[in-house]
Interface confidence: medium
């Protein structure tokens, strides 16, 4: 069974998938469609790197531009370095500016909904 066929079998169970499962899927050439990606738990998507999302979505990564204002894509963008987002070649904006440090202050983030940044 190839990655695409495997994905079809597990698609209906993915809504509640944890980050670890999504990271594992990104290594299996599954080409997750955007409709499924948009239904994933935001907290599971946020830790994914740009490279992992690109591998997870395959050709569908090109559709992220259309979803950049919607969750979980919007929140995921806010967590990525702008330099990394730029490598996708999709014109996604809103990432962490180059030179900023991201502090993983869970309480701060829980209150504000955004990561705490320290300027250069």
């Amino acid at each position: 069974m190839n990655g695409s066929e495997y994905f079809v079998k597990i698609q209906s169970f993915l809504g509640g998938a944890p980050t670890e499962d999504l990271k594992a899927l990104s290594q299996q050439n599954v080409s997750m469609d955007l409709a499924t990606f948009m239904k994933l738990r935001t907290d599971a998507v946020l830790p994914l790197t740009v490279a992992e999302v690109q591998k997870l979505l395959g050709p569908h990564v090109e559709g992220l531009k259309a979803e950049e204002r919607h969750r979980p894509v919007r929140d995921w963008i806010l967590r990525q370095r702008q330099d990394d987002l730029d490598t996708l070649g999709l014109g996604l904006q809103g990432g962490i500016p180059n030179g900023y440090l991201v502090l993983d202050l869970s309480m701060q983030e829980a209150l504000s909904g955004t990561p705490c940044l320290l300027g250069p």
């Epitope: 050709p59 569908h60 070649g89 999709l90 014109g91």
Partner: antibody, heavy 120, light 107 residues
Framework: EVQLVQSGAEVKKPGASVKVSCKAS????????MHWVRQAPGQRLEWMGN????????NYNEKFKNRVTITVDKSASTAYMELSSLRSEDTAVYYC?????????????WGQGTLVTVSS | DIVMTQTPLSLSVTPGQPASISCKAS??????IAWYLQKPGQSPQALIY???YRYSGVPDRFSGSGSGTDFTLKISRVEAEDVGVYYC?????????FGGGTKVEIK
């Protein structure tokens, strides 16, 4: 208005290489991936690969993987497709087409096509 | 690779009559399908995306349906300008693949 202007027709000998250009205008070149599709006489359309204009990263159809190279010149908003070790079966019209422009998947815009004839 | 199989190979239609083209994918592609029309001597032009959505400027006599592996393009009333070769294409996974085409002619 989106425009894709390709280089002119080419006649090549078997074993040679050809490099076709595609100059894009009317949209942000680095925000949409550029794809190349070819059509041999009387044959179906055949996807060759694509390029991320921001990073230069590419995906290729395995059928062409060792012979095709897709590149970009960001400053000139131009994509290139080079095919090496040409054989008679490579005689075809080659098209460039960006994907997902205007947030809609599919190839909504195509270049005018470049006829490459391989003949001894 | 996902193989896209179109039927029929050709279609001869009286103006004003309907036409229907089928496209079958060798594996599930969801609704990640587009349809194109290639008129003689021209580049392909996009008609339908996501299986059933018309691109702007495409007449409403064109409609698409289907999901999974079976898809259909319908022309409610064929006009002279609709002649050409129609292609389906999947963009569900790499490599992107096209159907073999259906040639539509006017009787």
């Amino acid at each position: 208005e989106v425009q894709l202007v390709q280089s002119g027709a080419e006649v090549k000998k078997p074993g040679a290489s050809v490099k076709v250009s595609c100059k894009a205008s009317g949209y942000t070149f680095t925000s949409y991936w550029m794809h190349w599709v070819r059509q041999a006489p009387g044959q179906r359309l055949e996807w060759m690969g694509n390029v991320n204009p921001s990073s230069g990263g590419s995906n290729y159809n395995e059928k062409f993987k060792n012979r095709v190279t897709i590149t970009v010149d960001k400053s000139a908003s131009t994509a290139y497709m080079e095919l090496s070790s040409l054989r008679s079966e490579d005689t075809a019209v080659y098209y460039c087409a960006p994907h997902y422009i205007g947030s809609r998947p599919g190839f909504a815009y195509w270049g005018q096509g470049t006829l490459v004839t391989v003949s001894s | 690779d996902i193989v896209m199989t179109q039927t029929p190979l050709s279609l001869s239609v009286t103006p004003g009559q309907p036409a229907s083209i089928s496209c079958k994918a060798s594996q599930n592609v969801g609704t990640n399908i587009a349809w194109y029309l290639q008129k003689p001597g021209q580049s392909p032009q996009a008609l339908i995306y996501s299986a059933s959505y018309r691109y702007s400027g495409v007449p409403d006599r064109f409609s698409g349906s289907g999901s999974g592996t079976d898809f259909t393009l319908k022309i409610s009333r064929v006009e002279a300008e609709d002649v050409g070769v129609y292609y389906c294409q999947q963009y569900n996974s790499y490599p992107l693949t096209f159907g073999g085409g259906t040639k539509v002619e006017i009787k």
